[in-house]
């Protein structure tokens, strides 16, 4: 399977909420013998590999923000820790996987990465990730709402295959 980032760039005004999204593509097994681990973290654009560095999102690590669920299930972070930081990650059974960030500040600007680990029990594991940029703006040049820019189909940075 692959992970795609429908939007490579989100430009938002300060104080707004935004939902960053990754989507699983290809043959995603929804059987009972599959478990998905999914998480989010901040990173930087490396010269060779995007998403190599793992930094916290609002002081929450990728461990704090992870979800795990069976192939046929949906999931979301309901723990107080994430919500106290204005964060919620969620996953549906259509392959969409997102993190919502509330009340954005300029400090939230940066590169965000999603990571998905698919565990096929008694068989194998695969891991894939995707990247997207968030720009939080303030002042007269800031948009009134978030503006999203679709990923180009040629943008191999944003799709990794397993």
């Amino acid at each position: 399977f692959k992970v795609a980032t429908p939007y490579s760039l989100y430009v938002c005004p300060e104080g707004q909420n935004v939902t960053l999204t990754c989507r699983l593509l290809g043959p995603v097994d929804k059987g009972h013998d599959v478990t998905f681990y999914k998480t989010w973290y901040r990173s930087s654009r490396g010269e060779v590999q995007t998403c190599s560095e793992r930094r916290p999102i609002r002081n929450l690590t990728f461990q704090d923000l992870h979800l795990h669920h069976g192939g046929h299930q949906a999931a979301n972070t309901s723990h107080d820790l994430a919500q106290r930081h204005g964060l919620e990650s969620a996953s549906d059974h259509h392959g969409n996987f997102s993190i919502t960030m509330r009340n954005l500040t300029l400090l939230d600007s940066g590169l965000y990465c999603c990571l998905v680990v698919e565990i096929r029990h008694h068989h194998s594991e695969h891991r894939v990730h995707g990247a997207m940029e968030l720009q939080v703006q303030t002042g007269k040049d800031a948009p009134s709402n978030c503006v999203v820019y679709p990923s180009s189909s040629q943008d191999s940075e944003n799709i990794t295959a397993a």
Epitope: G46, I119, R127
Partner: antibody, heavy 120, light 106 residues
């Protein structure tokens, strides 16, 4: 601080079953974010992953050893085991138990290892 | 199975030298590669994960790079305490290890 400790016989006869146990302290084996695995190292040679067990009891095994390996888990005792059947001299090695973080990927905590010799 | 080919199998260098070890995967593994240090009689110790991330507490003279199939591990200024065997391991799929590189002091 998480600690793993291997235990079991140091000498096993050819064709018998090698049985080792890994006792985990300082953390729960039932934690959902981890694999618990076995790796071996023949004297003077490299590392070979044997297999891993997931908190739910599901397993992954090295394809080359799959027919001879089982890794049971006992959450009540916070331990997991290795059973390797029909052993030969080629199975003589230092056997390590280790933890693998699913999201991070590598084996981050290891036992100190136990030497098992297969000989009659 | 993903095969990991590590080279050289052994090397000897002087204190202060820059030491480089390479690891090649038989198929694309993104950056899902780790490096371990193993001293005689001890279990392996995690040094680097995700090809280039230094594990907490590991000296900065150790570094890693690479992506896809080709990876490099570097000791910037070899110290006597770095005498050990170094292993790479991929975790893109079921774990497999490289054959190891024994590092000695001249």
């Amino acid at each position: 601080q998480l600690q793993l400790q291997e235990s079991g016989p140091g000498l096993v006869k050819p064709s018998e079953t090698l049985s080792l146990t890994c006792i985990v302290s300082g953390g729960s084996i039932s934690s959902s974010g981890y694999y618990w695995g076995w790796i071996r190292q023949p004297p003077g040679k490299g590392l070979e992953w044997i297999g891993s067990i997931f908190y739910s009891g599901n397993t992954h095994y090295n394809p080359s050893l799959k027919s001879r390996v089982t890794i049971p888990v006992d959450t009540s005792k916070n331990q997991f085991s290795l059973k390797l059947s029909s052993v030969t001299a080629a199975d003589s090695a230092v056997y390590y138990c280790a933890r693998r973080d699913i999201l991070t990927g590598p084996f981050d905590y290891w036992g100190q290892g136990t030497l098992v010799t297969v000989s009659s | 199975d993903i095969q990991m080919t590590q080279s050289p199998s052994s090397l000897s260098a002087s204190v202060g030298d820059r030491v480089t070890i390479t690891c090649q995967a038989s198929q694309h593994i993104t950056n899902y590669l780790t490096w371990y240090q193993q001293k005689p009689g001890n279990a392996p110790k995690l040094l680097i994960y995700d090809a280039s991330n230094l594990e907490t507490g590991v000296p900065s003279r150790f570094s890693g790079s690479g992506s896809g199939t080709d990876f490099t591990f570097t000791i910037n200024s070899l110290q006597p305490e770095d005498v050990a065997t170094y292993f790479c391991q991929q975790y893109d799929n079921l774990p497999t290890f490289g054959g190891g590189t024994k590092v000695e002091i001249k």
